[in-house]
Protein backbone atom coordinates (compact mmCIF):
# COMPACT_ATOMS: atom_id res chain seq x y z
CA UNK A 1 0.00 0.00 0.00
CA UNK A 2 2.96 2.36 0.86
CA UNK A 3 4.41 1.90 -2.95
CA UNK A 4 4.12 5.26 -4.67
CA UNK A 5 6.38 5.26 -7.24
CA UNK A 6 6.36 7.60 -9.53
CA UNK A 7 5.56 10.32 -7.72
CA UNK A 8 8.86 11.86 -6.96
CA UNK A 9 10.00 14.50 -9.37
CA UNK A 10 12.54 17.62 -8.91
CA UNK A 11 11.83 21.59 -9.20
CA UNK A 12 8.97 22.92 -8.37
CA UNK A 13 6.27 20.93 -6.41
CA UNK A 14 3.97 19.64 -9.11
CA UNK A 15 0.26 19.83 -8.45
CA UNK A 16 -0.26 16.15 -8.30
CA UNK A 17 1.72 16.55 -4.88
CA UNK A 18 -1.78 17.17 -3.31
CA UNK A 19 -2.88 13.87 -4.56
CA UNK A 20 0.11 12.25 -3.45
CA UNK A 21 -0.88 13.23 -0.13
CA UNK A 22 -3.98 12.68 -0.30
CA UNK A 23 -3.29 8.59 -0.84
CA UNK A 24 -0.22 9.05 1.54
CA UNK A 25 -3.31 10.27 4.36
CA UNK A 26 -5.51 7.42 2.99
CA UNK A 27 -2.41 5.03 3.57
CA UNK A 28 -2.38 6.00 6.96
CA UNK A 29 -5.84 5.17 7.98
CA UNK A 30 -5.89 2.04 6.82
CA UNK A 31 -2.30 1.24 8.29
CA UNK A 32 -2.72 2.92 11.95
CA UNK A 33 -6.06 1.90 12.17
CA UNK A 34 -6.42 -0.08 15.54
CA UNK A 35 -10.06 0.02 17.16
CA UNK A 36 -12.63 0.58 14.50
CA UNK A 37 -12.52 3.77 12.71
CA UNK A 38 -14.69 6.49 13.61
CA UNK A 39 -16.67 4.02 15.79
CA UNK A 40 -17.75 1.81 13.22
CA UNK A 41 -19.62 4.83 11.62
CA UNK A 42 -21.36 4.26 8.49
CA UNK A 43 -21.48 6.29 5.51
CA UNK A 44 -22.98 6.07 2.11
CA UNK A 45 -21.64 4.47 -0.72
CA UNK A 46 -20.62 5.85 -3.57
CA UNK A 47 -19.74 5.42 -7.56
CA UNK A 48 -16.20 5.25 -7.49
CA UNK A 49 -16.97 7.40 -11.14
CA UNK A 50 -16.00 10.49 -12.67
CA UNK A 51 -17.85 12.43 -9.56
CA UNK A 52 -15.93 10.18 -6.97
CA UNK A 53 -13.83 13.58 -5.16
CA UNK A 54 -16.97 15.22 -4.40
CA UNK A 55 -19.12 12.24 -3.60
CA UNK A 56 -16.22 10.89 -1.40
CA UNK A 57 -16.64 14.33 0.71
CA UNK A 58 -19.86 14.32 0.83
CA UNK A 59 -20.48 11.15 2.31
CA UNK A 60 -17.62 11.60 4.32
CA UNK A 61 -18.10 15.40 5.96
CA UNK A 62 -21.76 13.94 7.67
CA UNK A 63 -19.34 11.70 10.20
CA UNK A 64 -18.62 14.23 13.37
CA UNK A 65 -16.36 13.72 15.79
CA UNK A 66 -13.91 11.52 14.19
CA UNK A 67 -10.54 13.08 14.58
CA UNK A 68 -8.75 10.55 12.42
CA UNK A 69 -10.45 11.29 9.42
CA UNK A 70 -10.41 15.06 9.44
CA UNK A 71 -7.64 15.97 8.00
CA UNK A 72 -8.87 13.69 5.01
CA UNK A 73 -12.15 15.72 4.86
CA UNK A 74 -9.89 18.95 4.58
CA UNK A 75 -7.80 17.06 1.74
CA UNK A 76 -10.76 16.41 -0.55
CA UNK A 77 -12.35 19.67 -0.14
CA UNK A 78 -9.15 20.48 -2.06
CA UNK A 79 -10.36 18.22 -5.18
CA UNK A 80 -13.94 19.64 -5.25
CA UNK A 81 -15.08 21.89 -7.44
CA UNK A 82 -18.34 22.31 -5.53
CA UNK A 83 -19.50 23.32 -2.24
CA UNK A 84 -20.49 20.27 -0.44
CA UNK A 85 -22.38 20.55 2.87
CA UNK A 86 -23.29 17.83 5.80
CA UNK A 87 -26.59 16.45 5.00
CA UNK A 88 -26.24 17.37 1.41
CA UNK A 89 -27.54 14.43 -1.00
CA UNK A 90 -26.84 15.10 -5.00
CA UNK A 91 -27.02 12.43 -7.47
CA UNK A 92 -23.10 11.37 -7.09
CA UNK A 93 -24.15 9.28 -4.72
CA UNK A 94 -25.56 5.56 -4.81
CA UNK A 95 -27.97 6.32 -1.70
CA UNK A 96 -29.01 2.15 -1.18
CA UNK A 97 -25.94 1.24 0.84
CA UNK A 98 -24.44 2.26 3.50
CA UNK A 99 -20.45 0.92 4.16
CA UNK A 100 -18.25 1.03 7.49
CA UNK A 101 -16.00 4.00 7.08
CA UNK A 102 -13.10 1.80 7.25
CA UNK A 103 -14.37 -0.22 4.12
CA UNK A 104 -14.99 3.56 2.35
CA UNK A 105 -11.35 4.35 2.73
CA UNK A 106 -10.13 1.30 1.62
CA UNK A 107 -12.61 1.46 -1.81
CA UNK A 108 -11.37 5.48 -1.99
CA UNK A 109 -7.46 4.33 -1.88
CA UNK A 110 -8.02 1.35 -4.01
CA UNK A 111 -9.39 3.22 -6.98
CA UNK A 112 -7.32 6.09 -6.53
CA UNK A 113 -4.18 3.78 -6.99
CA UNK A 114 -5.38 1.92 -9.87
CA UNK A 115 -5.95 5.53 -11.32
CA UNK A 116 -2.54 6.47 -11.09
CA UNK A 117 -1.50 3.03 -12.36
CA UNK A 118 -3.12 3.89 -15.57
CA UNK A 119 -1.69 6.77 -15.83
CA UNK A 120 -4.37 9.04 -15.18
CA UNK A 121 -2.43 12.07 -13.25
CA UNK A 122 -0.44 14.88 -14.85
CA UNK B 1 -34.81 29.27 -15.90
CA UNK B 2 -30.83 28.22 -15.39
CA UNK B 3 -29.01 30.88 -17.39
CA UNK B 4 -24.82 31.66 -18.77
CA UNK B 5 -24.52 35.16 -20.40
CA UNK B 6 -21.27 36.38 -21.50
CA UNK B 7 -20.03 39.52 -22.37
CA UNK B 8 -17.14 41.66 -22.86
CA UNK B 9 -15.56 40.67 -26.05
CA UNK B 10 -14.49 42.52 -28.87
CA UNK B 11 -11.80 43.74 -31.08
CA UNK B 12 -8.51 44.16 -29.71
CA UNK B 13 -5.01 44.10 -31.27
CA UNK B 14 -1.88 41.88 -29.70
CA UNK B 15 -0.34 42.61 -26.39
CA UNK B 16 -3.60 44.02 -25.02
CA UNK B 17 -5.70 43.31 -22.85
CA UNK B 18 -9.80 41.93 -22.61
CA UNK B 19 -12.20 41.00 -19.49
CA UNK B 20 -14.83 38.43 -20.12
CA UNK B 21 -17.59 38.67 -17.86
CA UNK B 22 -20.44 35.33 -17.45
CA UNK B 23 -23.51 36.82 -15.70
CA UNK B 24 -25.37 33.41 -14.08
CA UNK B 25 -28.78 32.90 -13.03
CA UNK B 26 -30.94 30.42 -11.85
CA UNK B 27 -29.17 28.28 -9.63
CA UNK B 28 -27.33 28.99 -6.64
CA UNK B 29 -23.94 30.31 -9.05
CA UNK B 30 -21.82 30.03 -5.13
CA UNK B 31 -21.81 25.69 -4.92
CA UNK B 32 -20.57 25.11 -8.30
CA UNK B 33 -17.37 25.25 -9.93
CA UNK B 34 -17.28 26.89 -13.61
CA UNK B 35 -15.24 26.99 -16.45
CA UNK B 36 -13.99 28.90 -19.20
CA UNK B 37 -14.09 27.24 -22.97
CA UNK B 38 -13.12 28.73 -26.37
CA UNK B 39 -13.75 27.74 -29.75
CA UNK B 40 -10.87 29.18 -32.77
CA UNK B 41 -13.63 30.05 -35.70
CA UNK B 42 -14.20 26.68 -37.78
CA UNK B 43 -12.47 24.81 -35.34
CA UNK B 44 -13.08 22.48 -32.31
CA UNK B 45 -13.64 23.50 -28.13
CA UNK B 46 -11.16 24.32 -26.24
CA UNK B 47 -10.61 24.01 -22.12
CA UNK B 48 -9.55 27.22 -20.71
CA UNK B 49 -9.64 27.13 -17.18
CA UNK B 50 -11.63 25.74 -14.16
CA UNK B 51 -12.75 28.23 -10.70
CA UNK B 52 -13.78 25.84 -7.71
CA UNK B 53 -17.34 27.18 -6.44
CA UNK B 54 -15.50 29.55 -3.81
CA UNK B 55 -12.56 30.85 -5.93
CA UNK B 56 -10.07 28.54 -3.42
CA UNK B 57 -8.42 26.58 -6.62
CA UNK B 58 -7.96 27.37 -9.98
CA UNK B 59 -5.96 25.36 -13.01
CA UNK B 60 -5.72 26.95 -16.64
CA UNK B 61 -4.77 25.04 -20.37
CA UNK B 62 -0.88 25.13 -20.96
CA UNK B 63 -1.84 27.05 -23.78
CA UNK B 64 -3.21 30.02 -21.66
CA UNK B 65 -1.10 30.05 -18.27
CA UNK B 66 0.53 32.90 -16.95
CA UNK B 67 -1.67 35.37 -19.05
CA UNK B 68 -5.18 34.37 -18.35
CA UNK B 69 -7.00 34.80 -15.08
CA UNK B 70 -10.23 33.68 -13.92
CA UNK B 71 -11.86 34.67 -10.89
CA UNK B 72 -15.38 35.19 -9.91
CA UNK B 73 -17.73 37.12 -7.46
CA UNK B 74 -19.84 35.42 -5.68
CA UNK B 75 -22.03 38.27 -4.44
CA UNK B 76 -22.37 39.12 -8.01
CA UNK B 77 -23.04 36.24 -9.40
CA UNK B 78 -20.43 36.86 -12.08
CA UNK B 79 -18.01 34.83 -13.46
CA UNK B 80 -14.82 36.41 -14.99
CA UNK B 81 -11.74 35.74 -17.35
CA UNK B 82 -9.27 38.52 -17.33
CA UNK B 83 -7.19 37.84 -20.63
CA UNK B 84 -3.62 39.87 -20.74
CA UNK B 85 -0.92 39.78 -23.78
CA UNK B 86 -3.27 38.29 -25.80
CA UNK B 87 -2.23 36.90 -29.25
CA UNK B 88 -3.64 36.15 -32.74
CA UNK B 89 -4.52 32.41 -31.58
CA UNK B 90 -6.20 33.83 -29.02
CA UNK B 91 -9.16 34.32 -31.31
CA UNK B 92 -12.65 32.58 -30.46
CA UNK B 93 -15.61 32.61 -29.81
CA UNK B 94 -15.53 32.51 -25.40
CA UNK B 95 -18.23 30.60 -23.79
CA UNK B 96 -18.88 30.04 -19.85
CA UNK B 97 -19.85 26.66 -18.71
CA UNK B 98 -21.35 25.38 -15.24
CA UNK B 99 -19.39 21.85 -14.34
CA UNK B 100 -22.25 19.98 -13.52
CA UNK B 101 -22.31 18.79 -10.14
CA UNK B 102 -23.17 14.68 -10.69
CA UNK B 103 -19.80 14.32 -12.99
CA UNK B 104 -16.54 16.38 -12.37
CA UNK B 105 -16.45 15.77 -15.95
CA UNK B 106 -19.24 17.11 -17.54
CA UNK B 107 -20.42 20.98 -18.40
CA UNK B 108 -24.03 20.66 -18.64
CA UNK B 109 -24.96 24.50 -18.91
CA UNK B 110 -23.37 26.70 -21.04
CA UNK B 111 -23.18 30.03 -22.24
CA UNK B 112 -24.01 31.67 -25.92
CA UNK B 113 -20.57 32.59 -26.01
CA UNK B 114 -19.03 36.23 -26.54
CA UNK B 115 -16.86 36.44 -29.90
CA UNK B 116 -12.94 37.73 -29.28
CA UNK B 117 -10.92 38.69 -32.14
CA UNK B 118 -7.56 39.73 -31.84
CA UNK B 119 -5.99 41.31 -34.41
CA UNK B 120 -3.54 44.45 -35.42
CA UNK C 1 -1.85 15.29 -22.01
CA UNK C 2 -4.20 12.92 -23.08
CA UNK C 3 -4.94 13.05 -26.96
CA UNK C 4 -8.76 11.92 -28.05
CA UNK C 5 -9.12 10.73 -31.62
CA UNK C 6 -12.35 11.32 -33.51
CA UNK C 7 -13.72 9.25 -36.77
CA UNK C 8 -14.60 9.92 -39.18
CA UNK C 9 -13.91 13.38 -39.44
CA UNK C 10 -17.09 13.67 -41.44
CA UNK C 11 -19.84 11.38 -41.63
CA UNK C 12 -22.76 11.43 -44.44
CA UNK C 13 -25.71 9.45 -43.08
CA UNK C 14 -29.85 9.66 -44.33
CA UNK C 15 -32.55 10.39 -41.81
CA UNK C 16 -33.01 6.93 -40.56
CA UNK C 17 -29.78 5.21 -40.49
CA UNK C 18 -27.81 4.67 -37.79
CA UNK C 19 -24.98 6.80 -36.37
CA UNK C 20 -21.58 5.36 -34.80
CA UNK C 21 -19.02 7.52 -34.24
CA UNK C 22 -15.81 6.69 -32.28
CA UNK C 23 -13.60 8.47 -29.80
CA UNK C 24 -10.45 6.66 -29.03
CA UNK C 25 -7.82 7.81 -26.14
CA UNK C 26 -4.06 7.98 -26.43
CA UNK C 27 -4.29 6.49 -22.79
CA UNK C 28 -7.00 4.74 -20.89
CA UNK C 29 -9.45 7.31 -19.55
CA UNK C 30 -11.05 4.75 -17.49
CA UNK C 31 -14.79 5.32 -17.92
CA UNK C 32 -14.73 9.13 -17.79
CA UNK C 33 -15.64 10.09 -20.80
CA UNK C 34 -18.24 12.63 -21.85
CA UNK C 35 -20.00 13.59 -25.32
CA UNK C 36 -21.39 16.67 -26.32
CA UNK C 37 -23.14 17.82 -29.88
CA UNK C 38 -23.09 21.35 -31.20
CA UNK C 39 -25.22 22.94 -33.80
CA UNK C 40 -23.89 25.76 -36.06
CA UNK C 41 -23.85 28.89 -33.87
CA UNK C 42 -24.88 27.26 -30.55
CA UNK C 43 -23.08 26.41 -27.65
CA UNK C 44 -22.37 22.83 -27.03
CA UNK C 45 -24.89 20.45 -25.36
CA UNK C 46 -24.41 17.47 -23.38
CA UNK C 47 -25.26 14.11 -24.00
CA UNK C 48 -23.36 11.43 -22.30
CA UNK C 49 -21.36 11.46 -19.20
CA UNK C 50 -19.48 8.65 -17.76
CA UNK C 51 -19.42 7.62 -21.05
CA UNK C 52 -22.49 5.70 -20.74
CA UNK C 53 -25.07 7.61 -19.22
CA UNK C 54 -27.79 9.93 -20.68
CA UNK C 55 -27.68 13.62 -19.62
CA UNK C 56 -31.65 14.69 -18.72
CA UNK C 57 -33.35 15.58 -21.41
CA UNK C 58 -31.26 13.30 -23.67
CA UNK C 59 -33.57 10.94 -26.64
CA UNK C 60 -33.08 7.11 -25.52
CA UNK C 61 -31.94 7.29 -29.56
CA UNK C 62 -28.73 8.36 -28.05
CA UNK C 63 -26.52 5.94 -26.57
CA UNK C 64 -22.65 5.33 -25.46
CA UNK C 65 -20.22 2.78 -24.70
CA UNK C 66 -16.65 1.97 -24.02
CA UNK C 67 -13.96 2.38 -21.58
CA UNK C 68 -10.11 2.30 -21.42
CA UNK C 69 -9.33 4.05 -24.59
CA UNK C 70 -11.95 2.97 -27.12
CA UNK C 71 -15.54 4.54 -27.26
CA UNK C 72 -18.62 4.85 -29.56
CA UNK C 73 -21.67 7.36 -29.79
CA UNK C 74 -24.25 5.84 -31.45
CA UNK C 75 -27.60 7.18 -32.77
CA UNK C 76 -30.01 4.43 -33.51
CA UNK C 77 -32.22 6.30 -35.74
CA UNK C 78 -31.48 9.52 -37.05
CA UNK C 79 -33.71 12.35 -36.76
CA UNK C 80 -33.16 15.39 -39.02
CA UNK C 81 -32.22 17.60 -35.97
CA UNK C 82 -29.21 15.08 -34.85
CA UNK C 83 -27.13 16.31 -37.86
CA UNK C 84 -24.72 18.47 -36.12
CA UNK C 85 -20.72 18.58 -35.18
CA UNK C 86 -20.51 16.00 -32.06
CA UNK C 87 -16.96 16.24 -29.66
CA UNK C 88 -15.80 13.67 -27.17
CA UNK C 89 -13.95 14.93 -24.03
CA UNK C 90 -12.53 13.61 -21.02
CA UNK C 91 -10.82 15.05 -17.89
CA UNK C 92 -7.27 13.72 -16.14
CA UNK C 93 -7.75 12.79 -12.84
CA UNK C 94 -5.66 15.29 -11.11
CA UNK C 95 -4.74 18.21 -11.67
CA UNK C 96 -8.37 18.81 -13.58
CA UNK C 97 -7.30 19.43 -17.41
CA UNK C 98 -10.14 18.88 -19.96
CA UNK C 99 -9.32 17.70 -23.27
CA UNK C 100 -11.85 17.98 -26.47
CA UNK C 101 -11.48 15.90 -29.55
CA UNK C 102 -11.30 17.28 -32.73
CA UNK C 103 -14.97 16.43 -33.58
CA UNK C 104 -16.82 14.41 -36.14
CA UNK C 105 -19.12 16.59 -38.12
CA UNK C 106 -22.38 14.05 -39.05
CA UNK C 107 -24.24 15.39 -42.35
CA UNK C 108 -27.15 15.04 -44.47
CA UNK C 109 -26.23 12.64 -47.55
Known amino acids: LTCLGGFASPGPVPPSTALRELIEELVNITQNQKAPLCNGSMVWSINLTAGMYCAALESLINVSGCSAIEKTQRMLSGFCPHKVSAGQFSSLHVRDTKIEVAQFVKDLLLHLKKLFREGQFN | EVQLVESGGGVVQPGRSLRLSCAAS????????MHWVRQAPGKGLEWVAI????????YYADSVKGRFTISRDNSKNTLYLQMNSLRAEDTAVYYC?????????????WGQGTMVTVSS | EIVLTQSPATLSLSPGERAILSCRAG??????LVWYQQKPGQAPRLLIY???NRATGIPARFSGSGSGTDFTLTISSLEPEDFAVYYC???????????FGQGTKLEIK
Open chain 2, 97 to 109: ARLWFGDLDAFDI
Open chain 2, 26 to 33: GFTFSSYG
Open chain 2, 51 to 58: IWYDGSNK
Open chain 3, 27 to 32: QSVSSY
Open chain 3, 50 to 52: DAS
Open chain 3, 89 to 99: QQRSSWPPVYT
